[in-house]
């Protein structure tokens, strides 16, 4: 705890001290003080530099005494042996001894007292920058007129700061300009804009003479310019050093005046503006600028407008333009924005076809679209090119923006029929031969694929099981091909309405309009040994004459077998409705006359033993296009029969073609469309 | 009408071979696909293998793979089935079966052929 | 090759009881699955195929349903006739297989 004032005895005083001692005294006075420590009485045994036994007296690293020996006073009147003034607060006292003393020595007495210091006077450091006042335990500062004391209390400058300027035009000089500026003086100016505008400040060379830098380029008193991150200066000297006009690109500029303690000048005087901040004119690939100027600035707008197949994307959506606004920072707004190349992206794909993946889905690029060929064609037309457009869809010259079709070739075998070895009037065949078959197992009969979705058979193959199991694309009917080939799931069945339906059908007679529609649940894919069969051409060029061949084929009762084990075939020629009128009916359930035959129906056969039998009915009478001989269609459809073996009846399906098309259009599905 | 006819009882000793015929009448083995089961005493029923006439390929079973071997001889409409490195747990009854049409596995059944595999 | 399990592998019942026989195949077989009866000495006879189809001559109270890898034949009222063992078979993929076979025994 400091004191004014204190005692400092040696050990033992006034006794002899002892040998052998080290003792420290730490004085302290209050703050503001020096300590004025006297000695009374010094009695120490006395060596050369106190070596053996001393006191010691240090102020901070600073020995300021060591004694030994004996002192008596000077002076009559005083009792003062020794002394020490320090201008410091604090100080040590250290008395040491060593091992031997050869006489009796008794030490010292001393003392402190707190004294005043005059801060203004007794450092070589001056406190104030301008007046210095002392008083007991400190000093304080104080300034000429028209003068501040700072807030560090010691230096005084002029009150030239806290200036906010906020006109767009204005002028500023330094303090007593053109008189000489104050001495040890910070000033700073504030000139804040509307944002938008930048400070542009200009200064002519004769109106700047500031102190001039040291002999290490140093500027003693200086100019400094502040624009955000931006820093003009330090300037000083006569006349002024730097641009004459300064675009600061800025709405906010600080100016610092700063000045030392000597060599005044005249200062400096400046003049400032605000201009609209300016905004690059920026070249944006691919797009045209409306309107189109030389200069822009603060709050210009432009409708930026990207060139055909170009496009500016914002998050997911596309625009051909935009606007972009010149700002307050000088800077474009929606700058991000670019036009780039219109992206068609990934073509869609498109059922039983393919497009090759493209190199590029931007705008110009050509993809091409193929069906699967053979067994698919293009329906559309358009050649499956497409152009990546300007409106970012893939365009084709004849379809738009339409995508291609691929539809089922019709009536093309993948391997001809060619007869082989005769079996029970007909063939051998391999379902490639005739892909358009289709097997019906409850009953055992045969149906003609002729689309994606739809079966043609015969209405009596239908009428007692509307939800018949179908396959398709086996040559043979055992249970182990079955599992592998294609089974068909019927939606609906559609009998003719020309069919009439009897409650007991084995007893039937007519069978007029014998022919019925199988809706698909499912797309059939077509290929080698699945593909649909024609429809005829409604021109006469479809109509059948006597002679005409035909190739029937089914799994239908043989000489051997009541069922076929694998696909037979035969080729057939037309006949005269009345060969078949004539054959005798072999089990008749009703008498000859009853049997009805009428011209929806085609008489074939009697050739060779040639015919269709039990098990084949619904399956396709299929004539070679006379227009496409590459082609077959659909000219019957196995009916009914006196006697195998002999002439057959078939569908005349050329009859049901405005039916066939009616029904599957009104039950066609989005999918199909 | 179709019949089966298989050949009769056999009696081998462990490691030996046996042959089992199947003469179809009635039809022709062209139009036939022919399967072979066994049934060991007491035990469930073991679908073997079978000659598949679209592919023109034998298919046997994973378990009697590199053992069996099955033929035809059409001339003769005779199917038949050989066994090799026989085990006593090769012991059974092997039938010929003929496959169904239209989802129907087996049409036919031959009268089976007691094999007996002891030492 | 495909495995087919049954379950149960006996099964006790009376003249007159609704018999339900499970077989489970290890990958699906669609409805490509028959049922045999086989009685000691017999060669086995066919009763369903494609897992619902009755074969002709059969008693209507055998059915069969189920496709893809559950599948279920039922009994509707056991008659005597009907002790016997019953076997599942698959014959989807061209490698068939049974099952281990089902016993209807007298309870």
């Known amino acids: 705890e400091p004191t004014m004032y204190g005692e400092i005895l040696s050990p033992n005083y006034p006794q002899a001290y002892p040998s052998e001692v080290e003792k420290s005294w730490d004085i302290e006075v209050p703050e503001g003080y020096g300590i004025h420590l006297y000695f009374t009485h010094l009695d120490i045994e006395l060596s050369e530099n106190c070596a053996y036994d001393s006191v010691q007296i240090i102020s901070g690293d600073t020995e300021e005494g060591r004694l030994c020996g004996q002192r008596s006073s000077n002076n009559p009147h005083s009792p003062i042996v020794e002394e020490f003034q320090v201008p410091y607060n604090k100080l040590q006292v250290i008395f040491k001894s060593d091992f031997s003393n050869e006489e009796r020595f008794t030490g010292f007495a001393a003392y402190y007292v707190a004294t005043d210091i005059n801060e203004c006077t007794d450092f070589v450091d001056v406190p104030c920058s301008h007046f210095c006042n002392n008083f007991i335990g400190g000093y304080f500062c104080s300034c000429p007129p028209e003068y501040f004391l700072h807030d560090d209390m010691k230096n005084c400058g002029v009150n030239c700061s806290g200036d906010v300027f906020t006109a767009l035009i204005g002028e500023i000089a330094s303090p007593n300009y053109p008189k000489p500026y104050p001495e040890n003086s910070r000033c700073e100016y504030q000139i804040r804009l509307e944002k938008g505008f930048q400070v542009v400040v200009t200064l002519r060379r004769e109106d700047f003479d500031v102190e001039a830098a040291d002999s290490a380029g140093n500027c003693l008193d200086s100019l400094v310019f502040v624009a955000g991150d931006r820093q003009f200066g330090p300037y000083c000297g006569h006349g002024f050093p730097g641009p004459l006009n300064i675009e600061t690109k800025s709405n906010a500029l600080d100016i610092i005046f700063q000045t030392d303690l000597t060599g005044q000048k005249k200062g400096w005087k400046l003049r400032y503006h605000g201009d609209p901040m300016p905004c690059p004119k920026e070249d944006t690939p691919n797009s045209v600028w409306e309107p189109a100027k030389a200069k822009y600035v603060f709050r210009d707008v432009v409708q930026i407008t990207c060139l055909d197949g170009f496009e500016v994307v914002e998050g997911r959506v596309g625009a051909t333009s935009f606007y972009s606004t010149c700002q307050s920072n000088g800077k474009w707004s929606n700058s991000k924005l670019k036009c780039q190349p219109v992206d068609c992206g990934i073509p869609e794909s498109i059922e039983n076809g393919k497009v090759e993946d493209p190199e590029s889905t931007l705008f110009g690029s050509v993809i091409r679209y193929t069906c699967e060929e053979p067994y698919y064609y293009m329906e559309n037309g358009g050649g499956g090119e497409y152009h990546c457009a300007g409106n970012g869809s893939w365009v084709n010259e004849v379809l738009g923006p339409e995508l291609p079709k691929c539809v089922p070739v019709c009536g093309v075998p993948r391997e001809p029929f060619e007869e082989k070895q005769r079996i029970i009037g007909g063939s051998d065949a391999d379902i490639k031969n005739f892909p358009w078959q289709v097997f019906f197992d409850n009953p055992w009969a045969g149906g003609a694929l002729i689309n994606e979705y739809w079966v043609l058979t015969a209405a009596h193959v239908v009428e007692g099981n509307r939800e018949p199991t179908m396959y398709v694309g086996s040559t043979s009917v055992q249970t182990s091909r079955l599992a592998k080939s294609k089974m068909l799931t019927p939606e609906h069945v559609f009998i003719h309405p020309g069919w009439k339906l009897l409650e007991v059908p084995e007893g039937r007679t007519n069978f007029d309009n014998d022919i019925a529609l199988v809706r698909l649940k499912d797309p059939v894919k077509m290929g080698p040994t699945v593909s649909p069969i024609c429809l005829p051409g409604t021109s006469s060029d479809y109509n059948l004459m006597d002679g005409d061949l035909g190739l029937i084929s089914g799994w239908g009762r043989t000489e051997k077998r009541d069922r076929a084990v694998r696909l037979k075939a035969a080729r057939l020629p037309v006949a005269p409705l009345r060969k078949c009128k004539e054959v005798k009916v072999e089990k008749p359930t009703a008498d000859a006359e009853a049997y009805v035959f009428t011209p929806n129906m085609i008489c074939a056969g009697g050739e060779k033993g040639m015919d269709s039998c039990k098990g084949d009915s619904g399956g396709a009478f299929a004539v070679q296009d006379p227009n496409d001989k590459t082609k077959f269609y659909a000219a019957g459809l196995v009916s009914w029969g006196p006697q195998c073996g002999t002439y057959g009846l078939y569908t005349r399906v050329k009859n049901y073609v405005d039916w066939i098309m009616k029904t599957m259009q009104e039950n066609s599905t989005p999918r199909e469309d | 009408q179709v019949q089966l006819v298989q050949s009769g009882a056999e009696v081998k000793k462990p490691g030996a071979s046996v042959k089992v015929s199947c003469k179809v009448s009635?039809?022709?083995?062209?139009?036939?696909?022919m399967h072979w089961v066994r049934q060991a005493p007491g035990k469930g029923l073991e679908w073997m293998g079978t000659?598949?006439?679209?592919?023109?390929?034998?298919i046997y079973a994973q378990k009697f793979q590199g053992r069996v071997t099955m033929t035809e001889d059409t001339s003769t409409d005779t199917a038949y089935m050989e066994l090799s490195s026989l085990r006593s747990e090769d012991t059974a009854v092997y039938y010929c079966?003929?496959?169904?049409?239209?989802?129907?596995?087996?049409?036919?059944w031959g009268q089976g052929t007691l094999v007996t595999v002891s030492s | 090759d495909i495995q087919m399990t049954q379950s149960p592998s006996t099964l006790s019942a009376s003249v007159g009881d609704r018999v339900t026989i499970t077989c489970r195949a290890s990958q699906s077989i669609s409805s490509w699955l028959a049922w045999y009866q086989q009685k000691p000495g017999k060669a086995p006879k066919l009763l369903i195929y494609k897992a619902s189809s009755l074969e002709s001559g059969v008693p209507s109270r055998f059915s069969g349903s189920g496709s893809g890898t559950e599948f279920t034949l039922t009994i509707s009222s056991l008659q005597p006739d009907d002790f016997a063992t019953y076997y599942c078979q698959q014959h989807n993929s061209y490698r068939w297989t049974f099952g281990q076979g089902t016993k209807v025994e007298i309870k």
């Open positions: 079966v003929t496959e169904g049409l239209a989802g129907v596995p087996f049409d036919l």
């Open positions: 000659f598949d006439p679209e592919e023109g390929e034998t």
């Open positions: 009635g039809d022709t083995l062209t139009e036939l696909s």
